[in-house]
């Protein structure tokens, strides 16, 4: 659980109790079982621009 009173993690990141900080969801590529990856899976991905009209 994130400590009460702390700012929520920014979009594309998730709280890690193991590390006691917000972690970039891209890091789940290196270690998919990291504790913060559960939060990344639950959140929708950041929007992206289509490469075609």
């Amino acid at each position: 659980e994130q400590a009460p009173g702390t700012a929520p993690c920014s979009r594309g990141s998730s709280w890690s109790a193991d590390l006691d900080k917000c972690m970039d969801c891209a890091s789940c590529r290196a270690r998919p079982h990291s504790d913060f990856c559960l939060g990344c899976a639950a959140a929708p991905p950041a929007p992206f621009r289509l490469l075609w009209p």
């Epitope: 109790a17 590390l19 006691d20 590529r29 270690r31």
Partner: antibody, heavy 120, light 112 residues
Framework: QVQLVQSGAEVKKPGASVKVSCKAS????????IAWVKQAPGQGLEWIGE????????YYSEKFRGKATLTADTSTSTAYMELSSLRSEDTAVYFC?????????????WGQGTLVTVSS | DIVMTQSPLSLPVTPGEPASISCRSS???????????LYWYLQKPGQSPQLLIY???NRASGVPDRFSGSGSGTDFTLKISRVEAEDVGVYYC?????????FGQGTKVEIK
């Protein structure tokens, strides 16, 4: 450069305990996991557990729960593994290894190993 | 726990010739992100293990391009295109999909 330097070889009697150290340098100690791996004589590699040094949170293999205790001292950038109630089957080389958590995968770094011999 | 099984356990090789080692996992190492979490390590005599290949096919920093990894799901292969004398040692496959971290039994590569 990243370095993990382990303590020297130990000879212990059955029933005793031993504490192996792993001193890290060349990176921010609290940003990476330290894992511990056992290699019995002539055998393969066996994961014991790992610790997040910044928070002290630990994960253990079921086989080593109650046998190994992992701790870390952030003031000296040193991780420790204590093995209790030693038996002959605990005779092995024990390695510490830094494991990455980050997207920019920069590989694992291993200590040189510490030989623990349990003999009466 | 994921069980990793290697073959062969012993591999006599001739310098300059190719060699390959197989590794099978008891469950798929292919994550929903389309990455195979299979790793290869080499432990040279009297040394610590060193990472050769991560995520099935990516060479670790400083690893010669004669080493390559391939496969998918549960079946993986490490290939050495031309074996050199310095390649002797025990090769281990391992996964990084979940805890516990498990390794294959090891394949001992030695010069004929």
């Amino acid at each position: 450069q990243v370095q993990l330097v382990q303590s020297g070889a130990e000879v212990k009697k059955p029933g005793a305990s031993v504490k192996v150290s792993c001193k890290a340098s060349g990176y921010t100690f609290t940003d990476f996991i330290i894992a511990w791996v056992k290699q019995a004589p002539g055998q393969g590699l066996e994961w014991i557990g790992e610790i997040y040094p910044g928070t002290g949170r630990t994960y253990y293999s079921e086989k080593f729960r109650g046998k190994a205790t992992l701790t870390a001292d952030t003031s000296t950038s040193t991780a420790y593994m204590e093995l209790s109630s030693l038996r002959s089957e605990d005779t092995a080389v024990y390695f510490c290894a830094r494991r990455t958590i980050y997207y920019d995968y920069d590989g694992d770094y291993w200590g040189q190993g510490t030989l623990v011999t349990v003999s009466s | 726990d994921i069980v990793m099984t290697q073959s062969p356990l012993s591999l006599p090789v001739t310098p300059g010739e190719p060699a390959s080692i197989s590794c099978r996992s008891s469950q798929s190492l292919l994550h929903s992100n389309w990455i195979n979490y299979l790793y290869w390590y080499l432990q040279k005599p009297g040394q610590s293990p060193q990472l050769l290949i991560y995520q099935m096919s990516n060479r670790a920093s400083g690893v010669p391009d004669r080493f390559s990894g391939s496969g998918s799901g549960t079946d993986f292969t490490l290939k050495i295109s031309r074996v050199e004398a310095e390649d002797v040692g025990v090769y281990y496959c391992a996964h990084n999909l979940e805890l516990p971290w498990t390794f294959g039994q090891g394949t001992k590569v030695e010069i004929k």
